[in-house]
């Protein structure tokens, strides 16, 4: 025959524990029901009556099965540099996270206590390590053959446009400008055309040389790309 199911409250067998979603009440010395998430214990159990639960009031919550006498207060409203990613309900606390373009400089158990704006890398510098929810952007100088012409927390150094005949050599903060030779253009052959905004192009060129294989000066125009200042963080 199957064992008889005990209804709360009940006295546990010596050495055994209460079942799931039950707790042992020291005063009553009985196994009693826990309250479900979104509720709290209004009246504790006795030897003859089970726990009486009640719903959490506005701006309070319980996230777990519990027997707390009062629900927990939801955190304060999110600040202007934060977004509410989880609303305060009877079953969960409000969670504030940093809005796009910011990172969490000081975190708490859930969400963020203090947000800070992500560093923007200035022209001539690109993102070496992107910002995350909890870490700032790291900038690096654009190496020879690459550039960044934006002040941005997301743009990396891009390779210069590939030119066979260069009108203006690129540098750390500017793309190369090619000499146009295409007769389909409205300008005269040999005229200079500025490149399209970089975002519209998939291609670029000229990578960074190895220190041991820097290009010989026979390749360089008098005005070669100048390396960015050392030691600058770009913020």
């Amino acid at each position: 025959l199957p064992a008889q199911v005990a209804f709360t409250p009940y006295a546990p067998e010596p050495g055994s524990t209460c079942r799931l979603r039950e707790y042992y009440d020291q005063t009553a010395q009985m196994c009693c029901s826990k309250c479900s998430p979104g509720q709290h214990a209004k009246v504790f159990c006795t030897k003859t009556s089970d726990t009486v639960c009640d719903s959490c009031e506005d701006s309070t919550y319980t996230q777990l099965w519990n027997w707390v006498p009062e629900c927990l207060s939801c955190g304060s409203r999110c600040s202007s540099d934060q977004v509410e990613t989880q609303a305060c309900t009877r079953e969960q606390n409000r969670i504030c996270t940093c809005r796009p373009g910011w990172y969490c400089a000081l975190s708490k158990q859930e969400g963020c206590r203090l947000c800070a704006p992500l560093r923007k890398c200035r022209p001539g510098f690109g993102v070496a390590r992107p910002g995350t929810e909890t870490s700032d952007v790291v900038c690096k100088p654009c190496a020879p053959g690459t550039f960044s012409n934006t002040t941005s927390s997301t743009d990396i150094c891009r390779p210069h446009q590939i030119c066979n005949v260069v009108a203006i050599p690129g540098n750390a903060s500017m793309d190369a400008v090619c000499t146009s030779t295409s007769p389909t253009r409205s300008m005269a052959p040999g005229a200079v055309h500025l490149p399209q905004p970089v975002s519209t192009r998939s291609q670029h060129t000229q990578p960074t040389p190895e220190p041991s294989t820097a290009p010989s000066t026979s390749f360089l125009l008098p005005m070669g790309p100048s390396p960015p200042a050392e030691g600058s963080t770009g913020d």
Epitope: V165, T205, P209, T213
Partner: antibody
Framework: QVQLQQSGAELVRPGTSVKMSCKAS????????IGWTKQRPGHGLEWIGD????????NYNEKFKGKATLTADKSSSTAYLQFSSLTSEDSAIYYC???????????????WGQGTTLTVSS | QLVLTQSSSASFSLGASAKLTCTLS???????IEWYQQQPLKPPKFVME???????STGDGIPDRFSGSSSGADRYLNISNIQPEDEAIYIC?????????????FGGGTEVTVL
């Protein structure tokens, strides 16, 4: 010294796809473009495209757009060429190569892999 | 359109001087090109970069007997005292950004036989 080691020969069925690799060593992988070139007997060399692993920038020959996909894995210094919807026309030797560095003109390719032979046959 | 034109084959006597031609499309006559050598069953090898003024820089391990020169849209690869090991296909290549789109093209190649 600079080396580009390509994956072995492939025999595949028409309609399938293939991914070949090119492992670079002897230089900083992220600083140089890697190009891919196709060679069929009697057709000469045909540039497919290239990739700058430092930021995954790519160039494609218009003819191979939609057919070829170039990728690179910085952690293993390996470039990949994937060819899809294969036909007998894709049977060829495929070379990877490193584009030379100069700061002014568009440079060609100074180091080449040994080539991967692709045969598409049912 | 960026085009390179080469003659398909050429024969030279051992020890003679050879001059191979690569012709750029007329509107690209000022362009810098590259020469490659491809020996049978081997990948191409970079020989030199050749500019419109004839100045050139050769690749690693290329013998001094290889030189370059230019005239108008023609780019020449000169081989003095040609040797049996110079027997190969010589291919020219050129790249540029045209209308914001990068292209790299190869010539058809000239097959060199040393008699």
């Amino acid at each position: 010294q600079v080396q580009l080691q390509q994956s072995g020969a492939e025999l595949v069925r028409p309609g399938t796809s293939v991914k070949m690799s090119c492992k670079a060593s002897g230089y900083t992988f992220t600083n140089y473009w890697i190009g891919w070139t196709k060679q069929r007997p009697g057709h000469g060399l045909e540039w497919i495209g290239d990739i700058f692993p430092g930021g995954d920038f790519t160039n494609y020959n218009e003819k191979f757009k939609g057919k070829a996909t170039l990728t690179a894995d910085k952690s293993s210094s390996t470039a990949y060429l994937q060819f899809s919807s294969l036909t007998s026309e894709d049977s060829a030797i495929y070379y990877c190569s490193r584009r030379r560095f100069t700061t002014i003109v568009a440079p060609g390719f100074d180091y080449w892999g040994q080539g991967t032979t692709l045969t598409v046959s049912s | 359109q960026l085009v390179l034109t080469q003659s398909s084959s050429a024969s030279f006597s051992l020890g003679a001087s050879a001059k191979l031609t690569c012709t750029l499309s007329s509107q690209h006559s000022m362009y810098t090109i590259e020469w490659y050598q491809q020996q049978p069953l081997k990948p191409p090898k970079f020989v030199m970069e050749l500019k419109k003024d004839g100045s050139h820089s050769t690749g690693d391990g290329i013998p001094d007997r290889f030189s370059g020169s230019s005239s108008g849209a023609d780019r020449y690869l000169n081989i003095s005292n040609i040797q049996p090991e110079d027997e190969a296909i010589y291919i020219c290549g050129v790249g540029d950004t045209i209308k914001e789109q990068f292209v790299y093209v190869f010539g058809g190649g000239t097959e060199v036989t040393v008699l």
